[in-house]
């Protein structure tokens, strides 16, 4: 089992549209088949999963169960976006990059992007 | 509270196949990974199986791959595996357990059902 | 697979009494450990997560440390209600693989 560098921005702010785009880029110590991408949300000391995908490599990356998550990989490289934001959902957005097979398993986990979501103001009534 | 009761054990015969559930309340069960984990008469505990929060992915050891499935209904709040070509081996109390992240993001076995006993014998 | 070795298999203590059991990994797991305890007919309960976080409603007198392949289970001071089966696992991969346990007698 080895340990395993992830990079992601520090900072990201969502669209007005509630959506969110970072690279979660990882330090392929070995020739990697099987990779599966997890992005965690903490806020104060509660962690939950956001979305989860497991993809071979060269294919396309498939995030399952109704997933608010898409993402694109190349390489060493996953470009993730995050849909449907709102305010209450600004926080610390983990990318934890596992290499599934073949063995050695290897885990790596990014220092988290901030992502800050501003909910749009209502458009005000119009007279016309 | 959050509760997670199995059923489905039973005597069964080599060869056999037995589907067990676990209907779980007192929390949102779609927000989580669960799993089924056994311990053999002789006390070892093994993890047996995984599935993500909607069902897309799901993971086993060797000892069980090809044989067993997990799966769920979210809109029953249940947790299911079905085994087939049940071996003596196979002989144990199989729980279900909610998965929990830690401060580490990394999954443990935060909850689990009181079991039920599967015996696979002739 | 990572084999979890755990130490002693038995142990006989009085309460009041610290005691440790010690959980070895067959290769390097950094901090992903989890100790549980057991009880006679009961489903295993988490005490301890990432080598040394305390699971939610777990005393104090508990404690775990470690790091790598070496991870000890201390309670400083024990209770009637200790004596049970502790279980060391890692969470570092698959598959999760767990000890053989330390059952934990009354002297």
């Known amino acids: 089992c080895k340990a395993m560098h992830v990079a992601q921005p520090a900072v990201v702010l969502a669209s007005s549209r509630g959506i969110a785009s970072f690279v979660c880029e990882y330090a392929s110590p070995g020739k990697a088949t099987e990779v599966r991408v997890t992005v965690l949300r903490q806020a104060d000391s509660q962690v939950t999963e956001v979305c989860a995908a497991t993809y071979m490599m060269g294919n396309e990356l498939t995030f399952l169960d109704d997933s608010i998550c898409t993402g694109t990989s190349s390489g060493n490289q996953v470009n993730l976006t995050i849909q449907g934001l709102r305010a209450m959902d600004t926080g610390l957005y983990i990318c934890k990059v596992e290499l599934m097979y073949p063995p050695p398993y290897y885990l790596g986990i990014g220092n988290g992007t901030q992502i800050y979501v501003i909910d749009p103001e209502p458009c005000p009534d119009s007279d016309f | 509270e959050v509760q997670l009761v199995e059923s489905g054990g039973g005597l069964v015969q080599p060869g056999g196949s037995l589907r067990l559930s676990c209907a779980a309340s007192g929390f949102t069960f779609s927000s989580y990974t669960m799993s089924w984990v056994r311990q053999t008469p002789g006390k070892r505990l093994e993890w047996v199986a995984t599935i993500s929060r909607g069902g897309g992915y799901t993971s086993y050891p060797d000892s069980v791959k090809g044989r067993f499935t997990i799966s769920r209904d979210n809109s029953k709040n249940t947790l299911y595996l079905q085994m087939n070509s049940l071996r003596a081996e196979d002989t144990a109390m199989y729980y279900c357990a909610r998965e929990d992240y830690g401060s580490s993001y990394v999954h443990w076995f935060a909850y689990w059902g009181q079991g039920t006993l599967v015996t696979v014998s002739a | 697979d990572i084999q979890m070795t755990q130490s002693p298999s038995f142990l006989s203590a009085s309460v009041g009494d610290r005691v440790t059991i010690t959980c070895r990994a067959g290769?390097?797991?950094?901090?992903?450990l989890a100790w549980y305890q057991q009880k006679p007919g009961k489903a295993p309960k988490l005490l301890i997560y990432?080598?040394?976080t305390l699971a939610e409603g777990v005393p104090s007198r508990f404690s775990g440390s470690g790091s790598g392949t070496e991870f000890t289970l201390t309670i400083s001071s024990l209770q009637p209600e200790d004596f049970a089966t502790y279980y060391c696992?890692?969470?570092?991969?698959?598959?999760?693989?767990f000890g053989g346990g330390t059952k934990l007698e009354i002297k």
């Open positions: 696992q890692h969470h570092y991969g698959s598959p999760r693989t």
């Open positions: 990432n080598a040394r």
């Open positions: 290769e390097n797991i950094y901090s992903y």
